[in-house]
């Protein structure tokens, strides 16, 4: 005799497979606020969507626990090396977790790059940083993107800088 | 009394889970035709495969609507900066969508890089560009990879430059 | 009359969906042994985990056949160009497959970069290399990460250099 509970769970599994959590958020001019906070994102227009995930002040917020592949790309660019970016200071791009159990953000995936060559140069340069990896997130935990040197992040049309996740 | 329709759907869900759309296409010497078109790909030999996705003239073609993680990596290389690649002109690598309603390609994910340093330099250089993100695709829509400066794409044995997707 | 076997398979499918193979391994000080072997990884502490995959001497080991999205990021850094890294020799970062049928490792995904600019320079530089793509793996096959110039890999707290996979 088949367990109705199991049947319900299977039906639910099919439904949830159809709506497995996923999101893709895109960069906008308001993404980099220059406040030292995380980057902010477009969540609804253009290529952006949220399916089974929430959004709050730059953060993707999980509604169910599980393993998620999280990713972010940022488009970097400038002319020469901006003041304060010494030759030995890289651009740091990272994905960080916020959780109620710890007051400080936890590093998840981080990249460092020296994109602008020699500070003396006045040439225009472009670089791109991609991060992606699988992390475990509890329901209600938040993931944000930070670029310490946010003045170098180039935002245009939502295709150059973005942030997303999906459950695996 | 269990609904046979639901049972069939569950059996189908299991089958389709087993065969969830996925593809990985690899670079070949014919990938870069120098015609201004998208890059072309190997679809069957070596590491390349198509499962629940089609291929047509460089494009991955969806057979079912859904959210897909699409990705591409291109291996770039050269000696100094090729003629026409001014110091402020980057290499642009992008994933683009083709759909019948909008005949001009729509940007999905794009990266810019200044890989070759100073134009005066005659040194050999290598760089790699990776893109990946989740996008929604209707059945029959096409995704292509473009590198505007395609003469810089270095193709060798299908592991350096590639293009793929899977449903999430 | 519904096939019990099918029911069992569906129940199994639901269980396996819950526990679909996935892993994320992180860099540690012992990752780069300088022996010419693959990079070694943390499998349990911090962000690292194994779910339905095994680990052996730097390798992720599959327990079931299927298509896997495999990925790796390595953080590179140095001062100037180290001895032996001629201006035309790139850093090579790759994912390779080991299988009992072939004695030599098979290239899966490979990247080349010239991260350190001119060898004469004594400046500090940082770069990051990301690889990801879908490959088919049989049960018991192994995937490893190699960076030929492993002295350039910078390891710190498991967020800069990592290696993972999940079934698609």
């Amino acid at each position: 005799d088949q367990d109705t509970g199991s049947w319900e769970q299977l039906v639910q599994a099919r439904r949830s497979h159809k709506a497995s959590p996923a999101a893709h958020l895109t960069g906008a001019n308001s993404s980099s606020m220059g406040t030292g906070g995380p980057l902010l994102w477009e969540t609804q227009l253009g290529l952006a969507f949220l399916r089974g995930l929430g959004y709050h002040d730059g953060a993707l917020v999980t509604t169910q626990a599980g393993y998620y592949y999280i990713y972010s790309k940022v488009q970097l660019g400038g002319v020469g090396c901006p003041q304060g970016l010494a030759t030995d200071l890289p651009v740091t791009h990272g994905l960080y977790k916020r959780t109620t159990r710890y007051p400080e953000e936890l590093e998840l995936l981080v990249s460092r790059r020296s994109p602008c060559g020699r500070a003396a140069s006045s040439r225009v340069w472009w670089d791109s940083s991609f991060l992606g990896g699988v992390v475990h997130l509890e329901a209600g935990e938040e993931v944000v993107v930070r670029v310490l040197e946010e003045q170098l992040v180039r935002l245009r049309d939502g295709t150059r800088s973005y942030f997303g996740a999906f459950m695996v | 009394d269990q609904d046979t329709g639901s049972w069939e759907q569950l059996v189908q869900a299991r089958r389709s889970h087993k065969a969830s759309p996925a593809a990985h296409l690899t670079g070949a010497n014919s990938s870069s035709m120098g015609t201004g078109g998208p890059l072309l790909w190997e679809t069957q030999l070596g590491l390349a495969f198509l499962r629940g996705l089609g291929y047509h003239d460089g494009a991955l073609v969806t057979t079912q609507a859904g959210y897909y993680y699409i990705y591409s990596k291109v291996q770039l290389g050269g000696v100094g900066c090729p003629q026409g690649l001014a110091t402020d002109l980057p290499v642009t690598h992008g994933l683009y969508k083709r759909t019948t309603r909008y005949p001009e390609e729509l940007e999905l994910l794009v990266s810019r890089r200044s890989p070759c340093g100073r134009a005066a330099s005659s040194r050999v250089w290598w760089d790699s560009s990776f893109l990946g993100g989740v996008v929604h695709l209707e059945a029959g829509e096409e995704v292509v990879v473009r590198v505007l400066e395609e003469q810089l794409v270095r193709l060798r044995d299908g592991t350096r430059s590639y293009f793929g997707a899977f449903m999430v | 009359d519904q096939d019990t076997g099918s029911w069992e398979q569906l129940v199994q499918a639901r269980r396996s969906h819950k526990a679909s193979p996935a892993a994320h391994l992180t860099g540690a000080n012992s990752s780069s042994m300088g022996t010419g072997g693959p990079l070694l990884w943390e499998t349990q502490l911090g962000l690292a985990f194994l779910r339905g995959l095994g680990y052996h001497d730097g390798a992720l080991v599959t327990t079931q056949a299927g298509y896997y999205y495999i990925y790796s990021k390595v953080q590179l850094g140095g001062v100037g160009c180290p001895q032996g890294l001629a201006t035309d020799l790139p850093v090579t970062h790759g994912l390779y497959k080991r299988t009992t049928r072939y004695p030599e490792e098979l290239e899966l995904l490979v990247s080349r970069r010239s991260p350190c600019g001119r060898a004469a320079s004594s400046r500090v530089w940082w770069d990051s290399s990301f690889l990801g793509g879908v490959v088919h793996l049989e049960a018991g096959e192994e995937v490893v990460v190699r960076v030929l110039e492993e002295q350039l890999v910078r390891l710190r707290d498991g967020t800069r250099s990592y290696f993972g996979a999940f079934m698609v």
Partner: antibody, heavy 117, light 110 residues
């Protein structure tokens, strides 16, 4: 092909509510937003807001906050726009449109709502 | 956020070219390549003519073209025809899940 078909014209008294429907076909309904735009007689287009069909997130124009509610029924691929506490200046042609990326395409044929005592 | 600024009316003779402007700010028109244009004939629903500043959907005549310079987008109609007489509206993405319409321009074919 992609099509949006709206419900018929309505005549309402001030203070009443109206609910306009918009049935979609020819595409994956849950993968796009539905936007509502109105046009008073002889006036320009006024964006009212939209709803995301896959997660029911809404975004309403400031001036209509508290009076407008947008909903969807994914089982019938239908979007609804309800406007409460109607006033005479709500008399307008109400259009639904699929929100595709950052533009509206296609549009419904329009529903004329007349508010008159 | 206020509406984008369009001229109230423009006119031209058959065969001529006309241009309709749409002026915004660096936070909308100038900040993104997300400007669209709509044509509306009397008593009809609006119709998409241009998206992403300069791209035409299938079925739209190549006599219609779009461009952008700074904070101003433009719709140009060449070889003006009688059936082009209609109202035209621009629309721009303005960040933070916001889209802005222009006030509309009435095109008269003389």
């Amino acid at each position: 092909q992609v099509q949006l078909v709206q419900s018929g014209a309505e005549v309402k008294k001030p203070g009443a509510s109206v609910k306009v429907s918009c049935k979609a076909s020819g595409y994956t309904f849950t993968s796009y937003g539905i936007s509502w735009v109105r046009q008073a007689p002889g006036q320009g287009l006024e964006w009212m807001g939209w709803i995301s069909a896959h997660n029911a997130n809404t975004n309403y124009a400031q001036k209509l906050q508290g009076r407008v509610t947008m909903t969807t029924d994914t089982s019938t691929s239908t979007a609804y726009m309800e406007l409460r506490s109607l006033r005479s200046d709500d008399t307008a042609m109400y259009y639904c449109a699929r929100l595709y990326r950052n533009w509206f395409d296609p549009w419904g044929q329009g529903t004329l709502v007349t508010v008159s005592s | 956020q206020s509406a984008l600024t369009q001229p109230a009316s423009v006119s031209g003779s058959p065969g001529q070219s006309i241009t309709i402007s749409c002026t915004g700010t660096s936070s909308d028109v100038g900040g993104y390549n997300y400007v669209s244009w709509y044509q509306q004939h009397p008593g009809k629903a609006p119709k998409l003519m241009i998206y992403d500043v300069s791209k035409r959907p299938s079925g739209v005549s190549n006599r219609f073209s779009g461009s952008k310079s700074g904070n101003t987008a433009s719709l140009t109609i060449s070889g003006l025809q009688a059936e082009d007489e209609a109202d035209y509206y621009c629309c721009s993405y303005a960040g933070s899940s916001t889209l802005l319409f222009g006030g509309g321009t009435k095109l008269t074919v003389l």
